[in-house]
Amino acid sequence: MNGRVDYLVTEEEINLTRGPSGLGFNIVGGTDQQYVSNDSGIYVSRIKENGAAALDGRLQEGDKILSVNGQDLKNLLHQDAVDLFRNAGYAVSLRVQHRLQVQNGPIGHRGEGDPSG
């Protein structure tokens, strides 16, 4: 019998200073590139070693980015979201959603559209 897998969702404001090589992360998602079923949100898919985000330490792979400098990322095309980050300036404020897996009992099966696991 599978145990229940619960998720603890928290939000955090992360202020990054753009480094010599930029912010130092990759994203997936957007209205034209939904990776998570029924969710066109923007997700962090890679934190680059020694980049600004990695050195700050708070942003994690799998985090959902809700806004950049107060601008909502809902219903954006993937490239429009990318451009928003690239044009965000030197000091960048990110509102992010962390989704932590909390395991109860035996390991449950992860659904295809589930971004965690």
Partner: nanobody, 132 residues
């Protein structure tokens, strides 16, 4: 973190075929489908070199000139596995073959391809020996 385990290597005669597999164990909160995957190889006394790569979505594949037309990289996200099918093997294909992974998607800083650099996670390798 991502743990990578390669298999499928072995001894094969020139002209033969091998299919290498790499299974990824992905940490909680992450998913295999977000990772670009690559194969590299290192022959005795030589530097490690790029062989092939596939983007996180599977939509883009890249090959070194030395294996182009003889090898196919593919992935099965449901099985957390990437494959390298190698045909018409030559003695010069003899090497330890390594699987590598890195988060895919688009850099928020600059455009770059899925090719030969910036991999974050590496397997232990599987030996491929091609005899005359």
């Amino acid at each position: 973190d991502v743990q990578l385990v390669e298999s499928g290597g072995g001894l094969v005669q020139a002209g033969g075929s091998l299919r290498l597999s790499c299974v990824a164990s992905v940490a909680s909160g992450r998913t295999f489908g977000w990772y670009d995957m690559g194969w590299f190889r290192q022959a005795p006394g030589k530097e490690r070199e790029f062989v092939a790569a596939i983007s996180w979505s599977g939509g883009s594949t890249y090959y070194a000139d030395s294996v182009k037309g003889r090898s196919t990289i593919s992935r099965d996200n449901a099985k957390n596995t990437v494959y390298l099918q190698m045909n018409s093997l030559k003695p010069e294909d003899t090497a330890v073959y390594y699987c590598a992974a890195r988060g895919g998607g688009t850099s928020v800083d600059s455009d770059y391809d899925v090719g030969e650099f910036e991999y974050d996670y590496w397997g232990q390798g599987t030996q491929v020996t091609v005899s005359e």
